[in-house]
């Protein structure tokens, strides 16, 4: 049909933190290269129907469905989704093609389905069909990598049984401590599965796919380091592989390394040794202890000994099931408005946890730091001095853990007032929770010193959103005070705040803040 326009359908994926994705469904900003969706004419359909290739979208992803129409003259359009019509504003690009867009922000289940676009041009009418579904990430997995010895070679293979297939990389560092942080210049990354250079100080393997990134460190005892006060501890689940590396450097080759489990030499086939000369001609030896699939009886003290270095041990504990050990009792904190303060949770867990900090239904990233004693710690400092309930949640494959914190900010009360025909109420969220006084202002008491005690009702309520307490005081109106100014004052150890209310007949009530 010569009259049919040339149509192009494209999908634009937006990065999730992309501020360029606007609310408008007509002029989205392109943030990724568009993907052609084909848009073929659908055979045997009544009318002219184009069908775009099916679109699979991750949950929470933001996308734009876009149609480019090469047809003379003006066009008008209408989007229909689940029997609802949606506004459609075509515009023209630099090549004078009609452009129609539908922006879907933060994809959810309810936004999945068929999107129909009806276009009317001067020459003809036609329909374009988009089918949008959520990618089934339930089948996705991301498993922590583990190590295997490469057959007949002194090399380690890093394996992560994940779906989709992950990208595997080795993360190597040759300096000590803090300088081995991920983005440090001392860190070298190698995007490959096999590693031959096994003499480095710190060796990790990481696997990443759509679900994120998981890493496993090669557990190492360095005999040139002074023995730690706390014996290093390694947890494994039954069936997992055990790998421990013992490393030692000496001025010459005249030393050997041995592994023992509970004072018995490891069986042949459960260890292998490598050695090399370093740049300053000292000899580096490493001895790996490994068990391809651990059982309960592999638990115990693994000791690496050398004829030229102090021996060192690690306690290997084999568990049936993962765990998270921490105290889950809730904790309350009271701090000043400008005091520096962080929440912290100390825990021991295996496998490593995934965690979040939550405040007021908003989640914050959670960082964990390993301590020398086998525990880890997570701190949260980004509370911006907002009082309320903070929640730490952690989970791994086998366990879940939640801990509640309450943050109270010491501050002088701030009073808000409201009134009706029958009563006046004052509210304050100062901390410590304030006490209340009501005073009547009259000719006899122009400074409002005449205290009102009758008809006053105080209460504290939990403001659910932030989990913070709000104190209120209500004065029931009596004939004795109608038409007078009254003053409610909230006071605590940090100060007093008052509000003056005119108790007149029903109608708007003026409030005068008086601090």
């Amino acid at each position: 049909n010569q009259d049919l326009p040339v149509i192009k359908c494209v999908l634009i994926n937006h990065k999730n933190n992309d501020s360029s994705v606007g609310k408008s469904s007509s002029y989205p900003m392109v943030s990724e290269s568009p993907e052609d969706l084909g848009c073929a004419l659908r055979p045997q359909s009544s009318g002219t129907v184009y069908e775009a290739a099916a679109v699979e979208v991750d949950v929470s992803a933001s996308i734009t469905l876009q149609v480019l129409v090469d047809a003379p003259g003006n066009i008008s359009c209408l989007w229909v989704f689940k029997h609802s019509s949606l506004n459609c504003q075509p515009h023209f690009d630099l090549q004078n093609r009609g452009v129609v867009s539908m922006v879907i922000l933060k994809m959810t289940e309810t936004q999945a389905g068929e999107y129909l676009l009806f276009i009317q041009s001067e020459a003809t009418n036609y329909t374009i069909l988009f089918t949008v579904s959520i990618r089934n990430t339930l089948l996705y997995t991301l498993r922590r990598p583990y190590f295997r010895k490469m057959e007949n070679q002194d090399a380690l293979v890093c394996i992560s049984e994940s779906v989709p297939e992950p990208i595997v990389e080795w993360v190597l560092c040759d300096s000590q401590g803090e300088s081995c942080k991920e983005e440090s210049p001392a860190v070298v990354k190698k995007e490959e599965k096999v590693l031959h250079e096994l003499f480095g100080t710190d060796i990790r393997c990481c696997a990443r796919n759509e679900l994120g990134r998981e890493c496993t460190r090669l557990f190492t005892i360095d005999l040139n380091q002074t023995p730690q006060t706390t014996l290093p501890q390694l947890f494994l689940k039954v069936g997992e592989p055990l790998w421990i590396r013992c490393k030692a450097v000496h001025v010459n080759h005249g030393f050997g390394l041995t592994w023992e489990l509970e004072n018995k030499a490891l069986e042949e086939g459960n260890y292998f040794e490598m050695s090399t000369y370093s740049t300053n001609r000292t000899m580096i030896r490493i001895l790996f202890a490994f068990v391809s699939s651990v059982a309960r009886n592999d638990t115990g003290y693994y000791t690496c000994s050398s004829s030229k270095h102090p021996s060192q041990s690690a306690l290997v504990t084999i568990v049936e099931k993962g765990f998270i050990n921490a105290t889950n009792s809730s904790e309350d904190y009271e701090i000043d408005q400008y005091e520096e303060f962080c929440f912290s949770v100390r825990f021991k867990a295996y496998p490593q946890i995934r965690c979040t900090w939550t405040f007021s239904r908003k989640s914050f990233p959670c960082e964990q730091k390993g301590l020398d004693n086998g525990y880890s710690i997570s701190k949260f400092c980004n509370h911006k001095h907002q009082p309320g309930e903070y929640i730490f949640h952690a989970e791994n494959d086998d366990a879940q853990f939640t801990k509640m914190f309450t943050l109270n900010i010491r501050r002088k009360p701030q009073v808000l007032a409201e009134a009706s025909a029958s009563q006046a109420s004052c509210f304050s969220d100062g901390y410590p929770l304030p006490s209340w006084t009501w005073k009547k202002c009259s000719d006899k008491s122009p400074n409002c010193t005449e205290e009102i005690t009758e008809g006053v009702w105080n209460r504290k309520a939990n403001r659910k959103v932030f989990g913070q307490w709000v104190s209120s005081s209500t004065l029931n109106m009596s004939e004795a005070i109608k038409g007078f100014l009254v003053k409610c004052c909230a006071y605590n150890s940090l100060g007093t705040s008052c509000e003056t209310i005119l108790l007149n007949s029903p109608g708007p009530f003026p409030f005068i803040q008086d601090n």
Partner: nanobody, 111 residues
Framework: QVQLQESGGGLVQAGDSLRLSCAAS????????IDWYRQAPGNEREWVAQ???????FYADSVKGRFAISRDNAKNTVYLQMNSLKPEDTAVYYC?????WGQGTQVTVSS
């Protein structure tokens, strides 16, 4: 139940000697290496010396040439002979086998 008991600490003058003992029970003593550590007030616990089960000895740089570690497997005891003591050797001295620690013995060196 592994138990370690240190003894032999006390108050001495700088330049004097002391001999600490660590008696062990509940552990295959002859099959274990033993470490001595010390902790001065306000400081971290620091490693001092080790004797391996084969009798090899190792020392922290700060005590090399002055301290000597030895063991008597028949008595399940390890000794730390401390000579030419200095005020900076003042600390509580602990012995350790694997994750097991003794209660410690106080050594005070006055100048």
């Amino acid at each position: 139940q592994v138990q370690l008991q240190e003894s032999g600490g006390g108050l001495v003058q700088a330049g004097d000697s002391l001999r600490l003992s660590c008696a062990a029970s509940g552990v295959t003593f002859s099959a274990s290496y033993i470490d001595w550590y010390r902790q001065a007030p306000g400081n971290e616990r620091e490693w001092v010396a080790q004797i391996t089960r084969g009798g090899d000895s190792f020392y922290a740089d700060s005590v090399k040439g002055r301290f000597a570690i030895s063991r008597d497997n028949a008595k399940n005891t390890v000794y730390l002979q401390m000579n030419s003591l200095k005020p900076e050797d003042t600390a509580v001295y602990y012995c350790r086998v694997l994750s097991y620690w003794g209660q410690g013995t106080q050594v005070t060196v006055s100048s």
